[in-house]
């Protein structure tokens, strides 16, 4: 028999972590699976916004470019649009995902500055301008959101909300990377994070779960796009490398 | 409170250039905003002539670029208009204004030029 | 050039009446209108911004409406010193452009 559970890998049964583990787990439900994604955009350059009517410019990082911006929230969207089969019946990331507002908004918690737009294309192209100037715009948006990510409304004329679909806030930290001190207009980096419901004793719906995150793998891996660089993992990431390794070692 | 101020000539001949200059107080018009002409002819009539950006980008009414031209004094705060060659037709007020994010929110008082020989 | 039209030159009302100023622009300008109010021998006064936004200190017995070609200032019940002009502004597309204005009277 080969053991591909971290868990039972790396934990003695009776060490006191297994045991609290096994506790919290079977009172308040285990902790979520997480299926994230790291995304560049190593083609890009960093651009510069002037925000009208004052104020110094603002340096913004490759991958808060518009046009990036949308790339992303496409895959994103793509990726929301994942179904699985697990015992004949068809898996989507609506039937595993957090959903805390769940039954009164069913939206899935996704993590993600696409977030502070609602996934929205149009939220993301909404803008106050004229031929000279902009006065507001997802620049303007963003840097109000991650200074007030649970805003109903950014103060701007876009009078835009910040909250997630979910019904909660994205904070910033947890959805940009490679920004220095608290300039997350300089990130080089998106980080994408889809929580998943997880499971004690009950084998069938984490056997769904996992069926849609071997879907979710396979996708992102022969996903094709020259302008982004994903680094991704899913939560069943671990196990199938100890699978592969276990199978290769028995051969 | 922010104010502007226009001066210049009360008559200019045809053909002649006309410089006007406005004052601001209360901001510097290089800390923000963009600082913009227009112009009101007898009948009431306006007309919007150009801009200096507080970056110190420029735009000019297509309709005035050959002989328009503005400039500014930042150490004096003062931005200005020159017209060339100008005629009956150039007959106006003169009004500078800042361009909010909304629309012309601080205006001058008017400086009232006639072009007439 | 986007051309604004004002089609009354003149509006005739009473203290206490409801009238609706109307600006239409020659082509699709979106919200980007602004209306402004001048008093005899004053400088025009901004009133409302993006088509129905009411600037700061302006009563809110004038609300603006509209999109696209079709503009309106509506004053629900006019005061005495609401004898003005009042222009339309398009700063959507470059030159910028007003309306020729519209003369509001009280009998």
């Known amino acids: 028999r080969v053991t591909t559970n971290p868990v039972d890998l790396w934990s003695a049964p009776s060490s006191q972590a297994r045991l609290e583990k096994e506790y919290f787990d079977q009172h308040f439900g285990p902790f979520f699976r997480t299926e994230q994604l790291i995304i560049r955009a190593p083609l890009t350059d960093k651009h510069i916004y002037q925000p009208y009517p004052s104020g110094a410019d603002v340096p913004f990082g490759p991958p808060l470019d518009i046009q990036i911006l949308h790339q992303v929230l496409d895959l994103q969207i793509a990726i929301e649009n994942i179904t699985a089969s697990y015992d004949n019946e068809t898996v989507t990331l609506q039937d595993i995902c957090l959903a805390p507002l769940s039954p009164y908004n069913t939206n899935c918690t996704i993590l993600s500055v696409l977030n502070y737009f609602q996934n929205s294309h149009s939220v993301l192209d909404h803008k106050k301008g004229d031929d000279f100037f902009v006065y507001a715009d997802y620049h303007t948006h963003f840097l109000y959101c991650v200074r007030a990510p649970a805003s109903l409304n950014d103060t701007s004329l876009l009078h835009d909300p910040c909250l997630g679909t979910f019904g909660g806030p994205v904070f910033p930290w947890l959805v940009l990377g490679g920004y220095d001190d608290q300039n997350y207009n300089n990130a080089t980096a998106l980080v994408i994070t889809f929580p998943v419901n997880n499971y004690y004793n009950d084998t069938e719906k984490l056997q769904r779960a996992q069926a849609w995150e071997k879907e979710f793998i396979n996708f992102v891996k022969n996903y094709k796009n020259p302008n982004l660089t994903i680094s991704f993992t899913a939560e069943r990431s671990i196990e199938d490398e100890l699978n592969r390794e276990s199978d290769s070692d028995v051969f | 409170d922010v104010q502007l101020q226009e001066s210049g000539p009360d008559l200019v001949k045809p053909s002649q250039s006309l410089s006007l200059t406005c004052t601001v107080t209360g901001y510097s018009i290089t800390s923000g905003y963009s600082w913009h002409w227009i112009r009101q002819f007898p009948g009431n009539r306006l007309e919007w002539m150009d801009y200096i950006h507080y970056s110190g980008s420029i735009n000019y009414n297509p309709s005035l670029k050959s002989r328009i031209s503005i400039t500014r004094d930042t150490s004096k705060n003062q931005f200005f208009l020159q017209l060339n060659s100008v005629t009956t037709e150039d007959t106006a007020t003169y009004y500078c204004?800042?361009?909010?994010?909304?629309?012309?929110?601080?205006w001058g008082q008017g400086t009232t030029l006639t072009v007439s020989s | 050039d986007i051309v604004m039209t004002q089609s009354h030159k003149f509006m005739s009302t009473s203290v206490g009446d409801r009238v609706s100023i109307t600006c239409k622009a020659s082509?699709?300008?979106?919200?980007?209108v602004v209306w402004y109010q001048q008093k005899p021998g004053q400088s025009p006064k901004l009133l409302i911004y993006w088509a129905s936004t009411r600037h700061t200190g302006v009563p809110d017995r004038f609300t603006g409406s509209g999109s696209g070609t079709d503009f309106t200032l509506t004053i629900s019940s006019v005061q005495a010193e609401d004898l003005a002009l009042y222009y339309c502004q398009q700063h959507y597309t470059s030159p910028w452009t007003f309306g020729g204005g519209t003369k509001l009277e009280i009998k």
């Open positions: 082509q699709d300008v979106n919200t980007a």
């Open positions: 204004a800042r361009w909010g994010a909304t629309g012309f929110d601080y």
